[in-house]
Amino acid sequence: APVRSLNCTLRDSQQKSLVMSGPYELKALHLQGQDMEQQVVFSMSFVQGEESNDKIPVALGLKEKNLYLSCVLKDDKPTLQLESVDPKNYPKKKMEKRFVFNKIEINNKLEFESAQFPNWYISTSQAENMPVFLGGTKGGQDITDFTMQFVSS
């Protein structure tokens, strides 16, 4: 079945942008001017998820790349990774659970909770130039709030 998708950039609540750091990692840092062109453009898709009143299930792919953010156990810890997929089959309505994030949107601030690991969120560090990761705490030092901006192609 076809899915609704959009192209966007994400910034954390400290206005740090997300950029590629090597082939399979994202990092967050402050960008200005022409450097803004470095930021990753996501293809966010509306996918199937579990019933909820305030959570909207989405998948986060990298635009025009066959890479999706996914959540897996590594050394017994929920971990965020970029995973290659077959572009002929993605995005799809019924994404595997590791690719699904529950988008929680309050006052134009977005959180992305892992569907595979409830209460684990896409997170950034306070520090500059650090990897984007899956964090198990909300409201602590790490940042779990993002803003989204559409990207015109």
Partner: antibody, heavy 119, light 108 residues
Framework: EVQLVESGGGLVQPGGSLRLSCTVS????????MSWVRQAPGKGLEWVGI???????YYASWAKGRFTISKDTSKNTVYLQMNSLRAEDTAVYYC?????????????WGQGTLVTVSS | EIVMTQSPSTLSASVGDRVIITCQAS??????LSWYQQKPGKAPKLLIY???TLASGVPSRFSGSGSGAEFTLTISSLQPDDFATYYC??????????FGQGTKLTVL
């Protein structure tokens, strides 16, 4: 305060074209999706389509090909281009804001603009 | 495409009555359903989303329930301001969004 104001409606002949505008204030089109919904006189609501970014638009099956949604974020305006108009396109056309991305429901609506297709 | 069917099409009731409007989807839509109220000459107003969550500023006499393909809107004690037309809406069916045909609530 969130506001949506439609304009551009009026009388048009069958086969003609019309472009409706929806100017918004109190929020940014760079973070909210916008939809068009129409209502024929004395009839129910009918979804036309929705726009996220300029490249991501989705339409009701009956609207594909004849109707096009676009936007100019710098002008805070969303457009509905309607071509090859027919008598059955006569309706009040509303623009509406999607409450949250992919929520599919609409929390703010304009007052509507009437389009009459008649010779 | 998913088709939404409301019943009844028209409903007469009195102030203080408990009113139930039903909406059926042609296939399962989980809880991706909203309800709107519309008064003549006015734009629709969002009442309920995700089948049961009350929208901001909506009185608590309105409630929604259901999941899958069967949904209900209940007004626990009808007030004079509630006479209007009510629409259900499928909000999560693939790329398309669809409204029911409406239920007109009139004074008995």
């Amino acid at each position: 305060e969130v506001q949506l104001v439609e304009s551009g409606g009026g009388l048009v002949q069958p086969g003609g074209s019309l472009r409706l505008s929806c100017t918004v204030s109190g929020f940014s089109l760079s973070s909210y999706a916008m939809s068009w919904v129409r209502q024929a006189p004395g009839k129910g609501l009918e979804w036309v389509g929705i726009i996220y970014d300029s490249a991501s638009t989705y339409y009701a099956s009956w609207a594909k090909g004849r109707f096009t949604i676009s936007k100019d974020t710098s002008k805070n305006t969303v457009y509905l281009q309607m071509n090859s108009l027919r008598a059955e396109d006569t309706a009040v056309y509303y623009c509406a804001r999607e409450r949250a991305i992919f929520s599919g429901d609409f929390d703010y609506w304009g007052q509507g603009t009437l389009v009459t297709v008649s010779s | 495409e998913i088709v939404m069917t409301q019943s009844p099409s028209t409903l007469s009731a009195s102030v203080g009555d408990r009113v139930i409007i039903t909406c059926q989807a042609s296939q399962s839509i989980d809880n991706w359903l909203s309800w709107y109220q519309q008064k003549p000459g006015k734009a629709p107003k969002l009442l309920i989303y995700r089948a049961s969550t009350l929208a901001s500023g909506v009185p608590s006499r309105f409630s929604g329930s259901g999941s899958g393909a069967e949904f209900t809107l209940t007004i626990s004690s009808l007030q004079p301001d509630d006479f209007a037309t009510y629409y259900c809406q499928n909000t999560g069916g693939g790329v398309s969004i669809a409204f029911g045909q409406g239920t007109k609530l009139t004074v008995l």
